[in-house]
Amino acid sequence: MAVTACQGLGFVVSLIGIAGIIAATCMDQWSTQDLYNNPVTAVFNYQGLWRSCVRESSGFTECRGYFTLLGLPAMLQAVRALMIVGIVLGAIGLLVSIFALKCIRIGSMEDSAKANMTLTSGIMFIVSGLCAIAGVSVFANMLVTNFWMSTANMYTGMGGMVQTVQTRYTFGAALFVGWVAGGLTLIGGVMMCIACRGLAPEETNYKAVSYHASGHSVAYKPGGFKASTGFGSNTKNKKIYDGGARTEDEVQSYPSKHDYV
Protein backbone atom coordinates (compact mmCIF):
# COMPACT_ATOMS: atom_id res chain seq x y z
CA MET A 1 0.00 0.00 0.00
CA ALA A 2 2.83 2.36 0.96
CA VAL A 3 4.59 1.55 -2.32
CA THR A 4 1.46 2.39 -4.34
CA ALA A 5 1.05 5.66 -2.41
CA CYS A 6 4.72 6.59 -2.91
CA GLN A 7 4.52 5.79 -6.61
CA GLY A 8 1.23 7.65 -7.08
CA LEU A 9 2.47 10.68 -5.16
CA GLY A 10 5.73 10.66 -7.12
CA PHE A 11 3.74 10.60 -10.35
CA VAL A 12 1.48 13.52 -9.28
CA VAL A 13 4.42 15.62 -7.99
CA SER A 14 6.34 15.00 -11.23
CA LEU A 15 3.26 15.84 -13.30
CA ILE A 16 2.90 19.19 -11.50
CA GLY A 17 6.65 19.79 -11.88
CA ILE A 18 6.68 19.12 -15.61
CA ALA A 19 3.61 21.32 -16.11
CA GLY A 20 5.56 24.03 -14.27
CA ILE A 21 8.64 23.53 -16.46
CA ILE A 22 6.48 23.88 -19.58
CA ALA A 23 4.83 27.01 -18.12
CA ALA A 24 8.21 28.56 -17.21
CA THR A 25 9.63 27.83 -20.68
CA CYS A 26 6.66 29.55 -22.34
CA MET A 27 6.55 32.55 -19.98
CA ASP A 28 7.80 35.97 -21.07
CA GLN A 29 8.99 37.13 -17.65
CA TRP A 30 12.43 35.56 -17.38
CA SER A 31 14.10 38.93 -17.03
CA THR A 32 12.35 42.16 -16.08
CA GLN A 33 13.83 45.63 -16.44
CA ASP A 34 12.87 49.14 -15.45
CA LEU A 35 14.18 51.67 -17.99
CA TYR A 36 15.22 54.63 -15.86
CA ASN A 37 16.29 57.28 -18.34
CA ASN A 38 12.93 57.81 -20.02
CA PRO A 39 11.48 61.22 -19.16
CA VAL A 40 8.08 60.51 -20.72
CA THR A 41 6.50 57.49 -19.14
CA ALA A 42 7.40 54.53 -16.96
CA VAL A 43 8.62 51.81 -19.29
CA PHE A 44 8.73 48.24 -18.13
CA ASN A 45 10.56 45.70 -20.25
CA TYR A 46 10.36 41.96 -19.79
CA GLN A 47 11.93 39.18 -21.77
CA GLY A 48 11.50 35.46 -22.13
CA LEU A 49 13.27 32.72 -24.03
CA TRP A 50 11.21 33.34 -27.14
CA ARG A 51 10.24 37.03 -27.21
CA SER A 52 10.77 40.44 -25.66
CA CYS A 53 7.99 42.77 -24.51
CA VAL A 54 7.69 46.46 -23.70
CA ARG A 55 4.92 47.73 -21.46
CA GLU A 56 4.28 51.41 -20.79
CA SER A 57 2.34 53.03 -17.96
CA SER A 58 -0.05 54.35 -20.62
CA GLY A 59 -1.19 50.76 -21.14
CA PHE A 60 0.63 50.18 -24.41
CA THR A 61 2.22 46.72 -24.65
CA GLU A 62 4.13 45.22 -27.55
CA CYS A 63 5.95 41.92 -27.83
CA ARG A 64 8.36 40.81 -30.50
CA GLY A 65 9.68 37.28 -31.04
CA TYR A 66 13.31 36.34 -31.57
CA PHE A 67 12.86 35.07 -35.10
CA THR A 68 16.53 34.39 -35.70
CA LEU A 69 18.45 31.40 -34.37
CA LEU A 70 22.02 32.17 -35.33
CA GLY A 71 22.30 35.74 -34.06
CA LEU A 72 21.10 35.09 -30.51
CA PRO A 73 23.44 34.85 -27.50
CA ALA A 74 24.86 31.36 -26.93
CA MET A 75 23.66 31.41 -23.32
CA LEU A 76 20.07 31.93 -24.43
CA GLN A 77 20.36 29.01 -26.85
CA ALA A 78 21.82 26.84 -24.10
CA VAL A 79 18.97 27.69 -21.72
CA ARG A 80 16.40 26.96 -24.44
CA ALA A 81 18.05 23.59 -25.10
CA LEU A 82 18.14 22.65 -21.41
CA MET A 83 14.47 23.52 -20.91
CA ILE A 84 13.36 21.63 -24.03
CA VAL A 85 15.41 18.55 -23.06
CA GLY A 86 13.82 18.75 -19.60
CA ILE A 87 10.32 18.90 -21.08
CA VAL A 88 10.94 16.04 -23.53
CA LEU A 89 12.47 13.77 -20.88
CA GLY A 90 9.69 14.65 -18.46
CA ALA A 91 6.99 13.93 -21.01
CA ILE A 92 8.51 10.53 -21.86
CA GLY A 93 8.89 9.85 -18.15
CA LEU A 94 5.21 10.62 -17.59
CA LEU A 95 4.19 8.31 -20.41
CA VAL A 96 6.33 5.47 -19.03
CA SER A 97 5.18 6.05 -15.44
CA ILE A 98 1.47 5.85 -16.40
CA PHE A 99 2.00 2.23 -17.51
CA ALA A 100 4.19 1.59 -14.47
CA LEU A 101 1.56 2.65 -11.92
CA LYS A 102 0.68 -0.25 -9.63
CA CYS A 103 -2.96 0.80 -9.51
CA ILE A 104 -3.31 0.42 -13.29
CA ARG A 105 -3.50 -3.13 -14.68
CA ILE A 106 -2.37 -3.64 -18.26
CA GLY A 107 -2.70 -7.25 -19.37
CA SER A 108 -0.51 -9.58 -17.36
CA MET A 109 2.35 -7.16 -16.72
CA GLU A 110 4.56 -8.49 -13.96
CA ASP A 111 5.71 -6.49 -10.95
CA SER A 112 9.31 -6.76 -12.11
CA ALA A 113 8.41 -5.03 -15.40
CA LYS A 114 6.51 -2.33 -13.50
CA ALA A 115 9.48 -1.89 -11.19
CA ASN A 116 11.82 -1.40 -14.15
CA MET A 117 9.44 1.11 -15.75
CA THR A 118 9.07 2.97 -12.44
CA LEU A 119 12.85 3.20 -12.09
CA THR A 120 13.21 4.38 -15.71
CA SER A 121 10.57 7.10 -15.28
CA GLY A 122 12.10 8.11 -11.94
CA ILE A 123 15.53 8.58 -13.52
CA MET A 124 13.92 10.55 -16.38
CA PHE A 125 12.15 12.82 -13.89
CA ILE A 126 15.38 13.40 -11.98
CA VAL A 127 17.29 14.33 -15.16
CA SER A 128 14.35 16.47 -16.33
CA GLY A 129 14.28 18.37 -13.03
CA LEU A 130 18.05 18.86 -13.11
CA CYS A 131 17.83 20.20 -16.69
CA ALA A 132 15.19 22.73 -15.67
CA ILE A 133 17.09 23.82 -12.56
CA ALA A 134 20.31 24.10 -14.59
CA GLY A 135 18.59 26.11 -17.35
CA VAL A 136 17.02 28.57 -14.94
CA SER A 137 20.25 28.88 -12.94
CA VAL A 138 22.32 29.56 -16.09
CA PHE A 139 19.91 32.34 -17.06
CA ALA A 140 19.92 33.81 -13.55
CA ASN A 141 23.73 33.74 -13.53
CA MET A 142 23.74 35.47 -16.93
CA LEU A 143 21.60 38.28 -15.48
CA VAL A 144 23.70 38.66 -12.34
CA THR A 145 27.12 38.61 -13.99
CA ASN A 146 26.50 40.49 -17.23
CA PHE A 147 23.65 42.89 -16.79
CA TRP A 148 23.23 44.07 -13.22
CA MET A 149 23.02 47.89 -13.37
CA SER A 150 24.87 48.37 -16.66
CA THR A 151 26.08 51.93 -16.96
CA ALA A 152 29.20 51.74 -19.14
CA ASN A 153 29.58 54.11 -22.12
CA MET A 154 31.23 53.46 -25.45
CA TYR A 155 31.62 55.26 -28.75
CA THR A 156 31.15 54.00 -32.29
CA GLY A 157 33.61 54.60 -35.06
CA MET A 158 30.87 56.39 -37.02
CA GLY A 159 31.07 59.40 -34.71
CA GLY A 160 27.66 58.83 -33.16
CA MET A 161 27.68 58.04 -29.46
CA VAL A 162 26.33 54.82 -27.96
CA GLN A 163 25.46 54.44 -24.31
CA THR A 164 24.19 51.39 -22.49
CA VAL A 165 20.89 52.37 -20.91
CA GLN A 166 20.92 52.37 -17.13
CA THR A 167 18.55 49.54 -16.36
CA ARG A 168 17.89 47.45 -13.29
CA TYR A 169 17.59 43.84 -14.31
CA THR A 170 15.61 41.68 -11.92
CA PHE A 171 14.64 38.02 -11.86
CA GLY A 172 11.32 37.46 -13.58
CA ALA A 173 8.54 35.22 -12.28
CA ALA A 174 9.51 32.48 -14.76
CA LEU A 175 12.80 31.90 -12.94
CA PHE A 176 11.04 31.14 -9.67
CA VAL A 177 8.44 28.98 -11.42
CA GLY A 178 11.27 27.09 -13.12
CA TRP A 179 13.23 26.52 -9.91
CA VAL A 180 10.17 25.27 -8.02
CA ALA A 181 8.98 23.13 -10.95
CA GLY A 182 12.44 21.62 -11.42
CA GLY A 183 12.61 20.83 -7.71
CA LEU A 184 9.19 19.18 -7.76
CA THR A 185 10.11 17.06 -10.79
CA LEU A 186 13.33 16.04 -9.05
CA ILE A 187 11.46 15.10 -5.84
CA GLY A 188 8.88 13.19 -7.88
CA GLY A 189 11.66 11.28 -9.61
CA VAL A 190 13.29 10.35 -6.30
CA MET A 191 9.90 9.13 -5.01
CA MET A 192 9.47 6.96 -8.11
CA CYS A 193 12.93 5.44 -7.57
CA ILE A 194 12.06 4.71 -3.93
CA ALA A 195 8.76 3.13 -5.04
CA CYS A 196 10.68 0.98 -7.50
CA ARG A 197 12.55 -0.71 -4.65
CA GLY A 198 9.28 -1.68 -3.03
CA LEU A 199 7.83 -2.97 -6.30
CA ALA A 200 10.77 -5.20 -7.19
CA PRO A 201 10.22 -8.70 -5.75
CA GLU A 202 13.45 -9.66 -3.98
CA GLU A 203 13.36 -13.29 -5.06
CA THR A 204 16.35 -15.48 -4.29
CA ASN A 205 16.77 -18.24 -6.78
CA TYR A 206 19.12 -20.32 -4.60
CA LYS A 207 17.49 -23.59 -3.57
CA ALA A 208 18.52 -25.58 -0.56
CA VAL A 209 20.37 -28.79 -1.30
CA SER A 210 20.68 -31.49 1.37
CA TYR A 211 23.39 -34.12 1.17
CA HIS A 212 22.96 -37.58 2.64
CA ALA A 213 26.16 -39.60 2.63
CA SER A 214 25.40 -43.28 2.01
CA GLY A 215 28.53 -44.91 3.23
CA HIS A 216 32.18 -44.33 2.48
CA SER A 217 32.13 -45.03 -1.22
CA VAL A 218 30.89 -41.78 -2.74
CA ALA A 219 31.72 -41.77 -6.39
CA TYR A 220 32.05 -38.32 -7.89
CA LYS A 221 31.66 -37.67 -11.58
CA PRO A 222 34.79 -36.05 -12.96
CA GLY A 223 34.35 -32.31 -13.30
CA GLY A 224 31.09 -32.52 -11.52
CA PHE A 225 31.80 -29.81 -8.93
CA LYS A 226 29.72 -26.89 -10.17
CA ALA A 227 28.14 -24.05 -8.23
CA SER A 228 24.55 -23.21 -9.05
CA THR A 229 23.65 -19.55 -8.77
CA GLY A 230 20.13 -19.90 -10.01
CA PHE A 231 20.88 -17.71 -13.04
CA GLY A 232 22.93 -20.14 -15.11
CA SER A 233 22.06 -23.27 -16.97
CA ASN A 234 21.70 -25.25 -13.78
CA THR A 235 18.49 -23.55 -12.68
CA LYS A 236 16.52 -26.77 -12.19
CA ASN A 237 19.07 -28.08 -9.68
CA LYS A 238 20.05 -31.13 -11.68
CA LYS A 239 21.89 -33.80 -9.74
CA ILE A 240 25.51 -32.83 -10.03
CA TYR A 241 26.92 -35.39 -7.58
CA ASP A 242 26.46 -39.13 -7.75
CA GLY A 243 26.06 -40.95 -4.55
CA GLY A 244 23.85 -39.85 -1.74
CA ALA A 245 23.47 -36.22 -2.77
CA ARG A 246 19.85 -35.37 -3.43
CA THR A 247 18.28 -32.05 -4.21
CA GLU A 248 15.28 -30.75 -2.34
CA ASP A 249 13.29 -31.12 -5.57
CA GLU A 250 13.76 -34.87 -5.36
CA VAL A 251 13.02 -35.11 -1.65
CA GLN A 252 9.84 -33.00 -1.65
CA SER A 253 6.78 -34.07 -3.57
CA TYR A 254 5.59 -30.54 -4.34
CA PRO A 255 8.54 -28.13 -4.43
CA SER A 256 7.62 -24.58 -3.42
CA LYS A 257 8.61 -21.57 -5.48
CA HIS A 258 9.81 -19.87 -2.31
CA ASP A 259 12.48 -22.25 -1.06
CA TYR A 260 14.88 -19.78 0.50
CA VAL A 261 18.22 -20.64 2.02
Epitope: N38, E62, Y66, G71, L76, M142, V165
Partner: nanobody, 122 residues
Framework: QVQLVESGGGLVQPGGSLRLSCAAS????????MGWYRQAPGKGLELVAV???????NYADSVKGRFTISRDNSKNTLYLQMNSLRAEDTAVYYC????????????????WGQGTLVTVSS
Amino acid sequence: QVQLVESGGGLVQPGGSLRLSCAASGSIFLINAMGWYRQAPGKGLELVAVITRGGSANYADSVKGRFTISRDNSKNTLYLQMNSLRAEDTAVYYCNADLNLRSDPFKWYTFWGQGTLVTVSS
Protein backbone atom coordinates in the same frame (compact mmCIF):
# COMPACT_ATOMS: atom_id res chain seq x y z
CA GLN B 1 26.15 48.11 -36.52
CA VAL B 2 23.28 50.52 -35.91
CA GLN B 3 23.14 53.95 -37.53
CA LEU B 4 20.88 56.91 -36.83
CA VAL B 5 20.86 59.37 -39.72
CA GLU B 6 19.21 62.78 -39.35
CA SER B 7 18.05 64.85 -42.29
CA GLY B 8 15.91 67.90 -43.04
CA GLY B 9 18.03 70.59 -41.36
CA GLY B 10 18.97 73.83 -43.02
CA LEU B 11 18.51 77.60 -43.07
CA VAL B 12 15.04 78.98 -42.43
CA GLN B 13 13.59 82.40 -41.72
CA PRO B 14 11.95 83.22 -38.36
CA GLY B 15 8.32 82.04 -38.33
CA GLY B 16 9.12 79.40 -40.93
CA SER B 17 8.80 75.62 -40.73
CA LEU B 18 11.08 72.60 -41.06
CA ARG B 19 10.57 68.86 -40.82
CA LEU B 20 13.42 66.77 -39.44
CA SER B 21 13.67 63.03 -40.01
CA CYS B 22 15.77 60.40 -38.29
CA ALA B 23 16.09 56.95 -39.81
CA ALA B 24 17.45 54.07 -37.73
CA SER B 25 19.05 51.18 -39.59
CA GLY B 26 21.12 48.11 -38.81
CA SER B 27 20.62 44.97 -36.75
CA ILE B 28 17.86 46.46 -34.59
CA PHE B 29 15.59 44.17 -32.62
CA LEU B 30 13.24 46.67 -30.97
CA ILE B 31 13.29 50.46 -30.61
CA ASN B 32 11.70 51.81 -27.46
CA ALA B 33 11.80 55.56 -26.81
CA MET B 34 13.10 57.95 -29.49
CA GLY B 35 13.86 61.60 -29.00
CA TRP B 36 15.24 64.87 -30.30
CA TYR B 37 17.88 66.82 -28.40
CA ARG B 38 19.59 70.03 -29.42
CA GLN B 39 22.80 71.85 -28.66
CA ALA B 40 22.95 75.58 -29.30
CA PRO B 41 26.38 77.17 -29.92
CA GLY B 42 28.25 77.42 -26.61
CA LYS B 43 25.49 75.68 -24.64
CA GLY B 44 24.78 72.21 -23.26
CA LEU B 45 22.55 69.47 -24.61
CA GLU B 46 18.83 70.17 -24.17
CA LEU B 47 15.86 67.82 -24.52
CA VAL B 48 13.45 68.95 -27.24
CA ALA B 49 10.93 66.12 -27.41
CA VAL B 50 10.69 62.41 -26.69
CA ILE B 51 8.18 59.81 -27.85
CA THR B 52 7.70 56.24 -26.63
CA ARG B 53 6.94 53.23 -28.80
CA GLY B 54 3.32 53.54 -27.76
CA GLY B 55 3.17 57.17 -28.88
CA SER B 56 3.31 59.00 -25.53
CA ALA B 57 5.14 62.27 -26.14
CA ASN B 58 6.83 64.83 -23.94
CA TYR B 59 8.08 68.30 -24.94
CA ALA B 60 10.40 70.92 -23.52
CA ASP B 61 8.44 73.97 -22.33
CA SER B 62 10.20 76.19 -24.86
CA VAL B 63 8.83 74.24 -27.84
CA LYS B 64 5.35 73.23 -26.61
CA GLY B 65 2.65 74.10 -29.10
CA ARG B 66 5.17 74.78 -31.87
CA PHE B 67 6.92 71.41 -32.37
CA THR B 68 5.31 68.02 -32.97
CA ILE B 69 7.15 64.72 -32.56
CA SER B 70 5.96 61.57 -34.33
CA ARG B 71 7.32 58.19 -35.35
CA ASP B 72 6.74 55.30 -37.71
CA ASN B 73 7.53 52.07 -35.84
CA SER B 74 7.38 49.92 -38.97
CA LYS B 75 10.07 52.05 -40.66
CA ASN B 76 12.09 52.79 -37.49
CA THR B 77 11.85 56.48 -38.34
CA LEU B 78 11.39 59.55 -36.12
CA TYR B 79 10.07 62.95 -37.21
CA LEU B 80 10.03 66.43 -35.75
CA GLN B 81 7.71 68.99 -37.30
CA MET B 82 8.97 72.47 -36.33
CA ASN B 83 6.63 75.42 -36.84
CA SER B 84 6.91 79.10 -35.88
CA LEU B 85 10.66 78.86 -35.66
CA ARG B 86 12.60 81.46 -33.67
CA ALA B 87 16.25 82.58 -33.64
CA GLU B 88 16.76 80.76 -30.31
CA ASP B 89 15.87 77.47 -32.01
CA THR B 90 19.19 77.63 -33.88
CA ALA B 91 21.16 74.54 -32.86
CA VAL B 92 22.48 71.17 -33.93
CA TYR B 93 19.58 68.71 -33.52
CA TYR B 94 20.44 65.18 -32.47
CA CYS B 95 18.23 62.14 -32.72
CA ASN B 96 18.49 59.40 -30.12
CA ALA B 97 16.89 55.99 -29.68
CA ASP B 98 16.69 53.41 -26.89
CA LEU B 99 16.94 50.05 -28.60
CA ASN B 100 18.22 46.54 -28.35
CA LEU B 101 20.06 44.56 -30.96
CA ARG B 102 19.14 41.28 -32.60
CA SER B 103 22.39 39.79 -31.33
CA ASP B 104 21.64 40.86 -27.74
CA PRO B 105 17.91 41.37 -27.13
CA PHE B 106 18.46 41.44 -23.35
CA LYS B 107 20.45 44.67 -23.25
CA TRP B 108 19.23 48.19 -24.00
CA TYR B 109 21.42 50.80 -25.69
CA THR B 110 20.94 54.48 -26.42
CA PHE B 111 22.23 55.32 -29.88
CA TRP B 112 22.81 58.92 -31.03
CA GLY B 113 22.92 60.34 -34.53
CA GLN B 114 25.56 62.70 -35.95
CA GLY B 115 23.24 65.68 -35.80
CA THR B 116 21.71 68.07 -38.32
CA LEU B 117 22.15 71.84 -38.17
CA VAL B 118 19.09 74.08 -38.04
CA THR B 119 19.74 77.79 -38.52
CA VAL B 120 16.92 80.29 -37.98
CA SER B 121 17.99 83.65 -39.38
CA SER B 122 16.59 86.47 -41.42
